[in-house]
Interface confidence: medium
């Protein structure tokens, strides 16, 4: 009779994480008598996966009934596969011996490869807000996938970005991998409603990529433009001066009125109006009692936006003319000085 051979017909088996792997093994003879064992790896450091004779292997089930005398099928199923189960599995026939069984013959081995899905990409932006024209970095991370091949793309509002760097770790062989990518995005004033998207495509996703997003509203700061104007006279000795605070984001804003450098009033932006681009407008007004002033009055609208250094705009109120004429035929000059280099406005009301 021909000597027993251990046949492992599958050179490799590919299984998705969470599924059951079937590792096939048959013997060509019933002789010699002795148990079968399954190992992962070869050599002295090999790991016992299943022992027909003894032991408890909760994840392993046999395909056929190994207790039957004429059984020659030693295939096993391993449940709930994870990337850590990847490796080469050997079906090994032992010969009955005393005191210990002796290894008789091994199969050629079956390489188990595990396909594992990447985790949902997590996109994170910079810790501090930045203003338009500045470049900010976003990172995207996804973990636990196998095999290593993966594609990552960045988008801003549907437009693919090209300025990014991606690493898949570890660089060597591993049971599973992680991807880390950093993209550079240039902010514009219109980006309050914009989104940055990281898209990950992997063989396990069957053409349906995973996406992670970050809203630029959490990253951008749009500084306000200021305009101070004098309104027509409302009463005999009163002049109404308004400060228009336009196109700012986020809403956190504090406005202070100064008369000749002295604080007159401080208020916080509350009833703002929202622009289509997501920025806000706000208007504050100051009623100035002209009769209380002998000389011209320098009115300053000072705005502190989102904890940044204050920007201001000034307006010179001429009180030398008869108050009734304010807003009719006396030139009230707006000598704007906006430190953020916004346009100088010189308004003359007739």
């Amino acid at each position: 009779e021909e000597e027993l051979q251990v046949i492992q017909p599958d050179k490799s088996v590919l299984v998705a994480a969470g599924e059951t792997a079937t590792l096939r093994c048959t013997a060509t003879s019933l002789i010699p008598v002795g148990p079968i064992q399954w190992f992962r790896g070869a050599g002295p450091g090999r790991e016992l996966i299943y022992n027909q004779k003894e032991g408890h292997f909760p994840r392993v089930t046999t395909v056929s009934d190994l207790t039957k005398r004429n059984n020659m099928d030693f295939s096993i199923r391993i449940g709930n596969i994870t990337p850590a189960d990847a490796g080469t599995y050997y079906c090994v026939k032992f010969r009955k011996g005393s005191p210990d069984d002796v290894e008789f013959k091994s199969g050629a081995g079956t390489e188990l490869s595990v396909r594992a899905k990447p985790s949902a990409p997590v996109v994170s932006g910079p810790a501090a807000r930045a203003t338009p024209q500045h470049t900010v970095s976003f990172t995207c991370e996804s973990h636990g996938f196998s095999p290593r091949d993966i594609t990552l793309k960045w988008f801003k509002n549907g437009n693919e970005l090209s300025d990014f760097q991606t690493n898949v770790d570890p660089v060597g062989e591993s049971v599973s991998y992680s991807i880390h990518s950093t993209a550079k995005v240039v902010l514009t004033r219109e980006d309050v409603h914009s989104q940055v998207i990281c898209e990950v495509a992997h063989v396990t996703l069957q053409g349906d990529p995973l996406r992670g997003t970050a809203n630029l509203s959490e990253t951008i700061r749009v500084p306000p433009t200021l305009e101070v104007t004098q309104q027509p006279v409302r009463a005999e000795n009163q002049v109404n001066v308004t400060c228009q605070v336009r196109k700012f984001y986020p809403q956190r804003l504090q406005l202070t009125w100064l008369e000749n450098g002295n604080v007159s009033r401080t208020e916080t932006a509350s009833t703002v109006t929202e622009n289509k681009d997501g920025t806000y407008n706000w208007m504050s007004w100051l009623l100035v009692n002209v009769s209380a002033h002998r000389d011209d009055v320098k009115l300053t609208c000072q705005v502190e936006h989102d904890g940044q250094p204050a920007v201001s705009k000034s307006h010179d109120l001429k009180v030398s003319a008869h108050p009734k004429e304010q807003g009719s035929n006396t030139a009230a000059e707006n000598t704007g000085s906006n430190e953020r280099h916004h346009h100088h406005h010189h308004h003359h009301h007739h």
């Epitope: 690493n167 770790d169 570890p170 660089v171 060597g172 062989e173 591993s174 880390h180």
Partner: antibody, heavy 119, light 107 residues
């Protein structure tokens, strides 16, 4: 035995390029990566990049990206490292080292090639 | 990029001493850490790969341990030929990076 033999010392002027070769013998050239590492006098080791000799996949350190080119000739079992736009701070010993494909350790090193950049 | 911090930068020891050098990675690198020895004017020599696996031909007085972010190289019973500079290197992520080195000098 496994050996990496590097080309001889070079003296270059700032702005020039240098190409260092590394001839491998004693093993299957295409079964390993080849790393390039440099050491500025009195300083530590700095990884520049690698080439996987089998499929010519290349990875460069961002620091040298655009200035370094790593190539290989499988028939000559030789790897090459070319560094362009040389400056005085590129004066260093340049090593090639055989790399493992799993842990990416460098188990065999060349003796090093001294490159001096001076006007 | 992963930074690898080695300490101490230098140490003085006597023949027969037990010496430990540590290496810390800025993020978890599993066991993707290797140790090298370099003598003046010579190329580095691999001592230990995969955090704790002794390279063939390296004396057993050298041993490595650690996983994740903290690693160490120990030389049991320092020999005259062990006075050199030692470098750790992470091979988890590109760019591959080396520690700054530890110079072991004779006391």
């Amino acid at each position: 035995q496994v050996q990496l033999v590097q080309s001889g010392a070079e003296v270059k002027k700032p702005g020039a390029s240098v190409k260092v070769s590394c001839k491998a013998s004693g093993y299957t050239f295409t079964s390993n990566a080849m790393h390039w590492v440099r050491q500025v006098p009195g300083q530590g080791l700095e990884w520049m990049g690698w080439i996987k000799a089998g499929n010519a996949e290349i990875k460069y350190s961002q620091k040298f990206q655009g200035r370094v080119t790593i190539t290989r000739d499988t028939s000559a079992t030789t790897a090459y490292m070319e560094l362009s736009s040389l400056r005085s701070e590129d004066t260093a010993v340049y090593y090639c080292a055989r790399g493992d494909y799993y842990y990416y350790y460098m188990d065999v090193w060349g003796k090093g090639t001294t490159v001096t950049v001076s006007s | 990029d992963i930074q690898v911090t080695q300490s101490p930068s230098s140490l003085s020891a006597s023949v027969g001493d037990r010496v430990t050098i540590t290496c810390r990675a800025s993020q978890s690198i599993s066991d993707f850490l290797n140790w090298y020895q370099q003598k003046p004017g010579k190329a580095p020599k691999l001592l230990i790969h995969a955090a704790s696996s002794l390279q063939a031909g390296v004396p057993s007085r050298f041993s490595g341990s650690g996983s994740g972010t903290d690693f160490s190289l120990t030389i049991n019973s320092l020999q005259p030929e062990d006075f050199a500079t030692y470098y750790c290197q992470q091979s988890y992520s590109t760019p591959l990076s080396f520690g700054g080195g530890t110079k072991v000098e004779i006391k």
